[in-house]
Protein backbone atom coordinates (compact mmCIF):
# COMPACT_ATOMS: atom_id res chain seq x y z
CA UNK A 1 0.00 0.00 0.00
CA UNK A 2 1.38 3.43 -0.97
CA UNK A 3 1.36 6.05 1.75
CA UNK A 4 -1.04 8.94 1.10
CA UNK A 5 0.95 12.13 0.51
CA UNK A 6 0.04 15.41 -1.19
CA UNK A 7 1.01 15.74 -4.84
CA UNK A 8 4.08 17.97 -5.26
CA UNK A 9 3.46 21.28 -6.97
CA UNK A 10 3.36 21.04 -10.77
CA UNK A 11 3.23 17.24 -10.84
CA UNK A 12 -0.54 16.72 -11.08
CA UNK A 13 -1.08 14.48 -14.11
CA UNK A 14 -3.23 16.10 -16.80
CA UNK A 15 -3.04 13.02 -19.01
CA UNK A 16 -1.66 9.52 -18.94
CA UNK A 17 1.66 9.81 -20.76
CA UNK A 18 5.32 8.76 -20.71
CA UNK A 19 6.29 11.39 -18.12
CA UNK A 20 4.59 9.21 -15.50
CA UNK A 21 7.26 6.52 -15.73
CA UNK A 22 9.55 8.90 -13.85
CA UNK A 23 7.05 9.25 -10.98
CA UNK A 24 7.74 7.35 -7.80
CA UNK A 25 4.99 5.10 -6.49
CA UNK A 26 3.79 7.66 -3.93
CA UNK A 27 3.72 10.37 -6.62
CA UNK A 28 1.58 8.20 -8.90
CA UNK A 29 -0.80 7.59 -5.99
CA UNK A 30 -1.00 11.28 -5.15
CA UNK A 31 -0.88 12.85 -8.61
CA UNK A 32 -2.88 10.58 -10.93
CA UNK A 33 -6.66 10.90 -10.80
CA UNK A 34 -8.40 7.52 -10.97
CA UNK A 35 -11.13 8.82 -13.28
CA UNK A 36 -8.49 10.17 -15.68
CA UNK A 37 -6.76 6.80 -15.59
CA UNK A 38 -10.03 4.99 -16.37
CA UNK A 39 -10.78 7.18 -19.39
CA UNK A 40 -7.24 6.85 -20.77
CA UNK A 41 -6.60 3.17 -20.04
CA UNK A 42 -5.83 2.59 -23.71
CA UNK A 43 -2.57 4.51 -23.22
CA UNK A 44 -1.31 2.54 -20.23
CA UNK A 45 -0.10 -0.48 -22.15
CA UNK A 46 2.03 1.65 -24.45
CA UNK A 47 3.86 3.21 -21.50
CA UNK A 48 6.70 1.16 -19.93
CA UNK A 49 5.59 1.29 -16.31
CA UNK A 50 7.39 -0.91 -13.81
CA UNK A 51 5.64 -3.88 -12.26
CA UNK A 52 5.40 -1.88 -9.01
CA UNK A 53 3.98 1.19 -10.72
CA UNK A 54 1.29 -1.01 -12.25
CA UNK A 55 0.39 -2.06 -8.69
CA UNK A 56 -0.40 1.57 -7.89
CA UNK A 57 -2.52 1.98 -11.01
CA UNK A 58 -4.48 -1.16 -10.16
CA UNK A 59 -5.05 0.13 -6.65
CA UNK A 60 -6.49 3.36 -8.07
CA UNK A 61 -8.88 1.47 -10.34
CA UNK A 62 -9.93 -0.80 -7.45
CA UNK A 63 -10.86 2.25 -5.40
CA UNK A 64 -12.80 3.78 -8.29
CA UNK A 65 -14.67 0.55 -9.15
CA UNK A 66 -15.09 -1.50 -5.95
CA UNK A 67 -17.91 -3.53 -7.56
CA UNK A 68 -15.77 -4.49 -10.57
CA UNK A 69 -14.38 -2.69 -13.62
CA UNK A 70 -16.58 -1.72 -16.58
CA UNK A 71 -15.82 -3.41 -19.89
CA UNK A 72 -14.50 -0.14 -21.36
CA UNK A 73 -11.66 -0.33 -18.81
CA UNK A 74 -11.22 -4.12 -18.94
CA UNK A 75 -10.64 -4.10 -22.70
CA UNK A 76 -7.60 -1.85 -22.29
CA UNK A 77 -6.01 -3.41 -19.20
CA UNK A 78 -3.08 -4.86 -21.12
CA UNK A 79 -0.27 -5.88 -18.73
CA UNK A 80 -2.41 -4.71 -15.84
CA UNK A 81 -4.52 -7.84 -16.41
CA UNK A 82 -1.64 -9.92 -15.03
CA UNK A 83 -2.13 -8.11 -11.71
CA UNK A 84 -5.75 -9.19 -11.38
CA UNK A 85 -6.75 -11.98 -9.02
CA UNK A 86 -9.48 -14.49 -9.85
CA UNK A 87 -11.55 -12.68 -7.18
CA UNK A 88 -11.18 -9.39 -9.09
CA UNK A 89 -12.20 -11.06 -12.35
CA UNK A 90 -15.30 -12.67 -10.84
CA UNK A 91 -16.69 -9.15 -10.40
CA UNK A 92 -16.47 -8.45 -14.13
CA UNK A 93 -19.09 -8.79 -16.82
CA UNK A 94 -17.18 -9.44 -20.05
CA UNK A 95 -19.43 -9.77 -23.10
CA UNK A 96 -17.26 -8.71 -26.02
CA UNK A 97 -15.09 -11.23 -27.84
CA UNK A 98 -12.70 -8.36 -28.63
CA UNK A 99 -12.18 -7.80 -24.90
CA UNK A 100 -11.49 -11.49 -24.38
CA UNK A 101 -8.97 -11.53 -27.26
CA UNK A 102 -7.19 -8.42 -25.94
CA UNK A 103 -6.68 -9.99 -22.52
CA UNK A 104 -5.65 -13.41 -23.85
CA UNK A 105 -3.07 -11.64 -26.02
CA UNK A 106 -1.33 -10.34 -22.87
CA UNK A 107 -0.88 -13.91 -21.60
CA UNK A 108 0.06 -15.32 -25.00
CA UNK A 109 2.75 -17.99 -24.97
CA UNK A 110 2.26 -18.72 -21.28
CA UNK A 111 0.28 -21.52 -19.67
CA UNK A 112 -3.31 -20.84 -18.75
CA UNK A 113 -3.22 -18.97 -15.44
CA UNK A 114 -5.98 -19.02 -12.81
CA UNK A 115 -6.83 -15.48 -13.96
CA UNK A 116 -7.29 -16.58 -17.57
CA UNK A 117 -9.31 -19.63 -16.53
CA UNK A 118 -11.62 -17.41 -14.47
CA UNK A 119 -11.94 -14.89 -17.30
CA UNK A 120 -12.89 -17.60 -19.79
CA UNK A 121 -15.36 -19.12 -17.34
CA UNK A 122 -17.03 -15.72 -16.79
CA UNK A 123 -17.16 -15.06 -20.52
CA UNK A 124 -18.60 -18.45 -21.49
CA UNK A 125 -21.17 -18.40 -18.69
CA UNK A 126 -22.22 -14.91 -19.79
CA UNK A 127 -22.77 -16.16 -23.33
CA UNK A 128 -24.69 -19.23 -22.20
CA UNK A 129 -22.84 -21.57 -24.54
CA UNK A 130 -19.48 -22.09 -26.19
CA UNK A 131 -20.23 -20.67 -29.65
CA UNK A 132 -17.98 -21.16 -32.66
CA UNK A 133 -16.27 -17.74 -32.53
CA UNK A 134 -15.44 -18.13 -28.86
CA UNK A 135 -14.15 -21.68 -29.34
CA UNK A 136 -12.10 -20.51 -32.32
CA UNK A 137 -10.50 -17.82 -30.21
CA UNK A 138 -9.87 -20.00 -27.17
CA UNK A 139 -8.32 -22.90 -29.04
CA UNK A 140 -6.12 -20.49 -31.02
CA UNK A 141 -4.61 -19.24 -27.74
CA UNK A 142 -4.87 -22.53 -25.81
CA UNK A 143 -4.97 -25.64 -28.00
CA UNK A 144 -5.70 -27.80 -24.94
CA UNK A 145 -8.64 -25.66 -23.83
CA UNK A 146 -11.37 -28.03 -24.96
CA UNK A 147 -9.87 -30.95 -23.03
CA UNK A 148 -9.75 -28.87 -19.85
CA UNK A 149 -13.55 -28.80 -19.75
CA UNK A 150 -15.63 -31.35 -17.88
CA UNK A 151 -18.03 -33.57 -19.86
CA UNK A 152 -20.85 -31.49 -18.37
CA UNK A 153 -19.32 -28.25 -19.66
CA UNK A 154 -18.67 -29.83 -23.06
CA UNK A 155 -22.33 -30.68 -23.36
CA UNK A 156 -23.02 -26.94 -23.88
CA UNK A 157 -20.85 -26.89 -27.02
CA UNK A 158 -23.18 -26.64 -30.04
CA UNK A 159 -22.38 -29.00 -32.96
CA UNK A 160 -21.74 -25.97 -35.20
CA UNK A 161 -18.75 -25.03 -33.01
CA UNK A 162 -17.07 -28.37 -33.74
CA UNK A 163 -15.93 -26.98 -37.10
CA UNK A 164 -13.47 -24.79 -35.21
CA UNK A 165 -11.75 -27.76 -33.55
CA UNK A 166 -8.34 -28.83 -34.85
CA UNK A 167 -6.86 -32.31 -34.24
CA UNK A 168 -4.26 -30.94 -31.80
CA UNK A 169 -7.05 -29.41 -29.71
CA UNK A 170 -8.12 -32.94 -28.74
CA UNK A 171 -4.68 -34.34 -27.91
CA UNK A 172 -5.22 -34.32 -24.14
CA UNK A 173 -8.91 -35.27 -24.11
CA UNK A 174 -9.85 -38.41 -22.20
CA UNK A 175 -12.49 -40.94 -23.33
CA UNK A 176 -15.24 -39.32 -21.23
CA UNK A 177 -14.73 -36.03 -23.03
CA UNK A 178 -14.62 -37.68 -26.46
CA UNK A 179 -17.84 -39.52 -25.61
CA UNK A 180 -19.52 -36.12 -25.41
CA UNK A 181 -17.76 -34.55 -28.41
CA UNK A 182 -18.08 -37.44 -30.85
CA UNK A 183 -21.88 -37.30 -31.34
CA UNK A 184 -21.62 -33.54 -31.87
CA UNK A 185 -18.90 -34.03 -34.49
CA UNK A 186 -20.94 -36.75 -36.21
CA UNK A 187 -23.85 -34.33 -36.43
CA UNK A 188 -21.67 -31.43 -37.57
CA UNK A 189 -20.00 -33.38 -40.40
CA UNK A 190 -22.97 -35.54 -41.44
CA UNK A 191 -23.38 -33.93 -44.86
CA UNK A 192 -19.77 -34.53 -45.97
CA UNK A 193 -18.80 -37.32 -48.35
CA UNK A 194 -16.91 -40.43 -47.21
CA UNK A 195 -13.24 -39.47 -47.42
CA UNK A 196 -13.77 -35.86 -46.34
CA UNK A 197 -15.97 -37.01 -43.49
CA UNK A 198 -13.30 -39.40 -42.24
CA UNK A 199 -10.62 -36.69 -42.27
CA UNK A 200 -12.82 -34.47 -40.08
CA UNK A 201 -14.22 -37.15 -37.74
CA UNK A 202 -10.90 -38.99 -37.23
CA UNK A 203 -9.78 -36.93 -34.21
CA UNK A 204 -13.09 -37.56 -32.44
CA UNK A 205 -13.23 -41.35 -32.96
CA UNK A 206 -12.10 -42.04 -29.40
CA UNK A 207 -15.77 -41.53 -28.58
CA UNK A 208 -17.22 -43.67 -31.40
CA UNK A 209 -19.43 -46.73 -30.68
CA UNK A 210 -18.97 -50.14 -32.32
CA UNK A 211 -21.71 -49.65 -34.92
CA UNK A 212 -20.02 -46.49 -36.27
CA UNK A 213 -16.67 -48.29 -36.52
CA UNK A 214 -18.37 -51.14 -38.40
CA UNK A 215 -19.89 -48.58 -40.80
CA UNK A 216 -16.49 -46.95 -41.34
CA UNK A 217 -14.94 -50.34 -42.13
CA UNK A 218 -17.18 -50.49 -45.19
CA UNK A 219 -15.82 -47.21 -46.56
CA UNK A 220 -12.14 -47.92 -47.35
CA UNK A 221 -10.95 -45.32 -44.86
CA UNK A 222 -7.49 -46.81 -44.10
CA UNK A 223 -7.41 -45.71 -40.47
CA UNK A 224 -3.88 -45.29 -39.11
CA UNK A 225 -2.71 -47.21 -36.06
CA UNK A 226 -2.40 -44.10 -33.90
CA UNK A 227 -6.13 -43.45 -34.35
CA UNK A 228 -7.00 -47.11 -33.84
CA UNK A 229 -5.09 -47.21 -30.55
CA UNK A 230 -7.19 -44.31 -29.24
CA UNK A 231 -10.51 -46.07 -29.89
CA UNK A 232 -12.63 -47.19 -26.96
CA UNK A 233 -11.73 -50.76 -26.00
CA UNK A 234 -15.41 -51.64 -25.56
CA UNK A 235 -16.10 -50.37 -29.09
CA UNK A 236 -13.24 -52.36 -30.66
CA UNK A 237 -13.87 -55.73 -28.96
CA UNK A 238 -16.96 -56.73 -30.98
CA UNK A 239 -15.26 -56.01 -34.34
CA UNK A 240 -14.44 -59.07 -36.43
CA UNK A 241 -11.01 -59.70 -37.91
CA UNK A 242 -12.43 -58.90 -41.36
CA UNK A 243 -13.86 -55.58 -40.11
CA UNK A 244 -10.58 -54.53 -38.51
CA UNK A 245 -8.73 -55.50 -41.68
CA UNK A 246 -11.07 -53.33 -43.76
CA UNK A 247 -10.92 -50.49 -41.25
CA UNK A 248 -7.13 -50.35 -41.20
CA UNK A 249 -6.49 -51.24 -44.83
CA UNK A 250 -2.72 -51.25 -45.48
CA UNK A 251 -2.11 -50.18 -41.87
CA UNK A 252 -3.28 -53.56 -40.59
CA UNK A 253 0.36 -54.70 -40.46
CA UNK A 254 0.87 -52.29 -37.55
CA UNK A 255 -1.21 -54.54 -35.31
CA UNK A 256 1.80 -56.80 -34.72
CA UNK A 257 3.79 -54.01 -33.06
CA UNK A 258 0.84 -53.17 -30.82
CA UNK A 259 -0.28 -56.71 -29.92
CA UNK A 260 0.60 -56.25 -26.23
CA UNK A 261 -1.16 -52.92 -25.87
CA UNK A 262 -4.80 -52.01 -25.44
CA UNK A 263 -7.14 -52.12 -27.28
CA UNK A 264 -5.29 -54.53 -29.64
CA UNK A 265 -4.34 -56.97 -26.86
CA UNK A 266 -7.92 -57.26 -25.58
CA UNK A 267 -9.29 -57.51 -29.13
CA UNK A 268 -6.90 -60.39 -29.97
CA UNK A 269 -8.10 -62.33 -26.92
CA UNK A 270 -11.66 -62.16 -28.28
CA UNK A 271 -10.86 -63.42 -31.81
CA UNK A 272 -10.57 -67.00 -33.06
CA UNK A 273 -6.93 -67.85 -33.68
CA UNK A 274 -7.96 -69.20 -37.11
CA UNK A 275 -9.28 -65.76 -38.08
CA UNK A 276 -6.19 -63.97 -36.76
CA UNK A 277 -3.99 -66.32 -38.79
CA UNK A 278 -5.68 -65.14 -41.99
CA UNK A 279 -3.97 -61.76 -41.48
CA UNK A 280 -0.56 -63.43 -41.80
CA UNK A 281 0.93 -61.20 -39.10
CA UNK A 282 1.76 -63.89 -36.54
CA UNK A 283 -0.67 -62.50 -33.99
CA UNK A 284 -0.97 -64.92 -31.05
CA UNK A 285 -3.38 -65.21 -28.14
CA UNK A 286 -6.63 -65.80 -29.95
CA UNK A 287 -9.23 -68.42 -28.97
CA UNK A 288 -7.89 -71.87 -29.93
CA UNK A 289 -9.73 -73.80 -32.63
CA UNK A 290 -12.54 -76.03 -31.36
CA UNK A 291 -13.34 -73.88 -28.32
CA UNK A 292 -16.88 -72.58 -27.91
CA UNK A 293 -17.21 -68.90 -27.01
CA UNK A 294 -20.07 -68.00 -24.72
CA UNK A 295 -20.96 -64.34 -24.52
CA UNK A 296 -22.10 -64.19 -20.91
CA UNK A 297 -23.01 -60.52 -21.10
CA UNK A 298 -25.54 -61.35 -23.84
CA UNK A 299 -26.92 -64.26 -21.79
CA UNK A 300 -27.39 -62.03 -18.75
CA UNK A 301 -29.19 -59.47 -20.86
CA UNK A 302 -31.65 -62.13 -22.12
CA UNK A 303 -32.43 -63.63 -18.70
Amino acid sequence: EVEKTACPSGKKAREIDESLIFYKKWELEACVDAALLATQMDRVNAIPFTYEQLDVLKHKLDELYPQGYPESVIQHLGYLFLKMSPEDIRKWNVTSLETLKALLEVNKGHEMSPQVATLIDRFVKGRGQLDKDTLDTLTAFYPGYLCSLSPEELSSVPPSSIWAVRPQDLDTCDPRQLDVLYPKARLAFQNMNGSEYFVKIQSFLGGAPTEDLKALSQQNVSMDLATFMKLRTDAVLPLTVAEVQKLLGPHVEGLKAEERHRPVRDWILRQRQDDLDTLGLGLQGGIPNGYLVLDLSMQEALS
Epitope: P48, F49, T50, Y51, L54, Y79, L82, H110
Partner: nanobody, 117 residues
Framework: QVQLVQSGGGLVHPGGSLRLSCAAS????????MRWYRQAPGKERDLVAL???????YYEDSVKGRFTITRDNPSNKVFLQMNSLKPEDTAVYYC???????????WGQGTQVTVST
Protein backbone atom coordinates in the same frame (compact mmCIF):
# COMPACT_ATOMS: atom_id res chain seq x y z
CA GLN B 1 22.33 -17.52 -11.59
CA VAL B 2 21.50 -14.02 -12.89
CA GLN B 3 24.06 -11.24 -12.58
CA LEU B 4 24.21 -7.65 -13.81
CA VAL B 5 27.79 -6.40 -13.63
CA GLN B 6 28.40 -2.66 -13.95
CA SER B 7 31.55 -0.82 -14.95
CA GLY B 8 32.68 2.60 -16.17
CA GLY B 9 32.11 4.95 -13.24
CA GLY B 10 34.65 7.32 -11.70
CA LEU B 11 35.61 10.91 -11.04
CA VAL B 12 35.18 13.45 -13.82
CA HIS B 13 35.32 17.25 -14.18
CA PRO B 14 32.17 19.23 -14.96
CA GLY B 15 31.52 19.15 -18.71
CA GLY B 16 33.26 15.80 -18.99
CA SER B 17 31.91 12.44 -20.19
CA LEU B 18 31.60 8.90 -18.85
CA ARG B 19 30.18 5.70 -20.29
CA LEU B 20 28.54 3.25 -17.93
CA SER B 21 28.21 -0.37 -18.94
CA CYS B 22 25.93 -3.12 -17.63
CA ALA B 23 26.68 -6.70 -18.70
CA ALA B 24 24.20 -9.48 -18.01
CA SER B 25 24.71 -13.19 -17.49
CA UNK B 26 21.96 -15.75 -16.89
CA UNK B 27 19.25 -13.80 -18.73
CA UNK B 28 18.66 -12.57 -22.27
CA UNK B 29 18.59 -8.78 -21.91
CA UNK B 30 16.80 -8.37 -25.24
CA UNK B 31 13.61 -9.57 -23.53
CA UNK B 32 13.85 -6.99 -20.74
CA UNK B 33 13.19 -3.31 -20.28
CA MET B 34 16.46 -1.84 -19.07
CA ARG B 35 16.67 1.15 -16.75
CA TRP B 36 19.39 3.27 -15.25
CA TYR B 37 18.61 4.72 -11.82
CA ARG B 38 20.72 7.00 -9.67
CA GLN B 39 20.78 7.70 -5.95
CA ALA B 40 22.45 10.79 -4.53
CA PRO B 41 23.44 10.80 -0.83
CA GLY B 42 20.40 11.19 1.40
CA LYS B 43 18.00 11.08 -1.57
CA GLU B 44 15.58 8.55 -3.06
CA ARG B 45 16.60 6.41 -6.01
CA ASP B 46 15.49 8.16 -9.23
CA LEU B 47 14.91 6.78 -12.72
CA VAL B 48 17.25 8.46 -15.20
CA ALA B 49 16.79 6.58 -18.47
CA LEU B 50 14.95 3.59 -19.86
CA UNK B 51 15.16 1.53 -23.02
CA UNK B 52 12.38 -0.92 -23.92
CA UNK B 53 12.81 -4.32 -25.50
CA UNK B 54 11.92 -2.78 -28.90
CA UNK B 55 14.61 -0.09 -28.49
CA UNK B 56 12.45 2.92 -27.56
CA UNK B 57 14.23 5.17 -25.07
CA TYR B 58 12.99 7.62 -22.42
CA TYR B 59 14.88 10.20 -20.36
CA GLU B 60 14.28 12.16 -17.19
CA ASP B 61 13.98 15.89 -17.98
CA SER B 62 17.26 16.93 -16.30
CA VAL B 63 19.36 14.59 -18.46
CA LYS B 64 17.60 14.96 -21.83
CA GLY B 65 20.08 15.83 -24.57
CA ARG B 66 23.05 14.91 -22.39
CA PHE B 67 22.57 11.21 -21.62
CA THR B 68 21.99 8.40 -24.13
CA ILE B 69 20.88 4.87 -23.26
CA THR B 70 21.67 2.10 -25.77
CA ARG B 71 21.56 -1.67 -25.81
CA ASP B 72 23.69 -4.22 -27.62
CA ASN B 73 21.66 -7.41 -27.66
CA PRO B 74 24.34 -9.71 -29.17
CA SER B 75 26.76 -8.90 -26.33
CA ASN B 76 23.94 -8.80 -23.73
CA LYS B 77 24.92 -5.30 -22.58
CA VAL B 78 23.30 -1.94 -21.92
CA PHE B 79 25.13 1.38 -21.85
CA LEU B 80 24.58 4.88 -20.51
CA GLN B 81 26.63 7.52 -22.29
CA MET B 82 26.80 10.63 -20.08
CA ASN B 83 28.01 13.87 -21.64
CA SER B 84 28.20 17.46 -20.34
CA LEU B 85 28.23 16.14 -16.80
CA LYS B 86 27.27 18.49 -13.94
CA PRO B 87 28.01 18.31 -10.22
CA GLU B 88 24.33 17.47 -9.60
CA ASP B 89 24.82 14.27 -11.61
CA THR B 90 26.99 12.96 -8.75
CA ALA B 91 25.37 9.75 -7.46
CA VAL B 92 25.57 5.98 -7.38
CA TYR B 93 24.16 4.68 -10.68
CA TYR B 94 22.35 1.34 -10.89
CA CYS B 95 21.24 -0.66 -13.90
CA UNK B 96 18.01 -2.63 -13.68
CA UNK B 97 16.39 -5.31 -15.83
CA UNK B 98 12.63 -5.79 -15.58
CA UNK B 99 9.72 -7.20 -17.50
CA UNK B 100 6.09 -6.19 -16.92
CA UNK B 101 5.16 -9.89 -16.95
CA UNK B 102 6.96 -10.67 -13.72
CA UNK B 103 7.59 -9.16 -10.27
CA UNK B 104 11.17 -10.44 -10.49
CA UNK B 105 13.68 -7.78 -11.51
CA UNK B 106 17.45 -7.65 -11.38
CA TRP B 107 19.88 -4.98 -10.21
CA GLY B 108 23.51 -4.20 -10.87
CA GLN B 109 25.88 -3.64 -7.95
CA GLY B 110 26.00 0.15 -8.42
CA THR B 111 28.70 2.44 -9.81
CA GLN B 112 29.86 5.67 -8.21
CA VAL B 113 29.91 8.71 -10.51
CA THR B 114 31.45 11.87 -9.05
CA VAL B 115 31.44 15.16 -10.95
CA SER B 116 33.77 17.63 -9.25
CA THR B 117 36.45 20.19 -10.04
Amino acid sequence: QVQLVQSGGGLVHPGGSLRLSCAASGIDLSLYRMRWYRQAPGKERDLVALITDDGTSYYEDSVKGRFTITRDNPSNKVFLQMNSLKPEDTAVYYCNAETPLSPVNYWGQGTQVTVST
